[in-house]
């Protein structure tokens, strides 16, 4: 059974992941981003279901495409280094989903823009955090 300390650790990791995802979204989805229109042409796979930590497998599998799109955003407006940012997210995702069980991610039929993709995972983090608090 999860202890209060492990629950707290999970909550902190989710909060960290949430802030990272929000930081990316804030950095690209604004009127100072000259590349936004181009970035919105890239398609991302969305999870068919995302209600448990194991479903973070679906996020992990899209981190490489995410990094590639973020590389387009490098400007005075976007102050994050995509490689470092995605690396940090990857570490948190691996810790959160655990490696004991292998989970095959199921994707929805419809693809999404980077903004829809990030918003979906932000909502996921917020939802799980609310169940922990």
């Amino acid at each position: 059974a999860p202890t209060s300390s492990s629950t707290k650790k999970t909550q902190l990791q989710l909060e960290h992941l949430l802030l990272d995802l929000q930081m990316i979204l804030n950095g690209i989805n604004n009127y100072k981003n000259p590349k936004l229109t181009r970035m919105l042409t890239f398609k991302f796979y969305m999870p068919k279901k995302a209600t448990e930590l194991k479903h973070l497998q679906c996020l992990e599998e899209e981190l490489k495409p995410l990094e590639e799109v973020l590389n387009l955003a490098q400007s005075k407006n976007f102050h994050l280094r995509p490689r470092d940012l995605i690396s940090n997210i990857n570490v948190i995702v691996l810790e959160l989903k655990g490696s004991e069980t292998t989970f095959m991610c199921e994707y929805a039929d419809e693809t999404a823009t980077i903004v829809e993709f990030l918003n979906r995972w932000i909502t996921f983090c917020q939802s799980i955090i609310s169940t922990l608090t």
Epitope: G27, N30, Y31
Partner: antibody, heavy 119, light 111 residues
């Protein structure tokens, strides 16, 4: 002093078009991004569109995308909003607002021009 | 879109007394450049909006020092230390970290 003066508002039938203007003075117009923001009667504020200082980038709210076009003429210090396929829900006071210097948001606003869409 | 929620929606205040307005965003407003683009606007009756505070706590030029802003992340507050008659109107918080969105507005009136 910074001044923004809107014009071009009026009563128009649904489906028709209207062009708003915003004349700027008191600052270097070509150095600033400019926005249109609207306010329906008795309601709150809604961002409509923005155009970069050099006119190269334009973004729109989903509610007006494909119907409204923002443009500017830096030689005339004037901003425009071409509004096509107007709907009743576009009825509002339309304000032009200057983007902040070194930060984001709106530091100076015009007095507004009222657009009424009604049959 | 980021949703901005203000409380209260109406605030009857006695002249000379303090007033406080809260604003909460549906997501963090911290941008990748480290700035938080949260601003406060005042709209007096029959007037266009006017900027009071930008980037959480910076007073715009000509704004009296009785107005102050504070907060971080998703929770922000505008305070008027001593309400004067000319402060009557509607106050809006707005974010420009993403595409601009506004709170519903808080009507400040004299009791």
């Amino acid at each position: 002093q910074v001044q923004l003066v809107e014009s071009g508002g009026g009563v128009v039938q649904p489906g028709r078009s209207l062009r708003l203007s915003c004349a700027a003075s008191g600052f270097t117009f070509s150095s600033y991004d400019i926005h249109w923001v609207r306010q329906a009667p008795g309601k709150g504020l809604e961002w409509v569109a923005v155009i970069w200082n050099d006119g190269s980038i334009k973004y729109y709210a989903d509610s007006v995308k494909g119907r409204f076009t923002i443009s500017r003429d830096n030689s005339k210090n004037t901003l425009y909003l071409q509004m096509n396929s107007l709907r009743a829900e576009d009825t509002a006071v339309y304000y032009c607002a200057r983007d902040g210097e070194q930060w984001r948001g709106f530091d100076y606003w015009g007095q507004g021009t009222l657009v009424t869409v009604s049959s | 879109d980021i949703v901005m929620t203000q409380t209260p929606l109406s605030s009857p205040v006695t002249l000379g007394q303090p007033a406080s307005i809260s604003c909460r965003s549906s997501q963090s407003l911290v941008n990748s450049d480290g700035n938080t683009y949260l601003n406060w606007l005042q709209q007096r009756p029959g007037q266009p909006p006017r900027l009071l505070i930008y980037k959480i706590s910076n007073r715009f030029s000509g704004v009296p020092d009785r107005f102050s802003g504070s907060g971080a992340g998703t929770d922000f507050t505008l305070k008027i230390s001593r309400v004067e008659a000319e402060d009557v109107g509607v106050y809006y918080c707005m974010q420009a970290t993403q595409f601009p969105t506004f709170g519903q507005g808080t009507k400040v009136e004299i009791k």
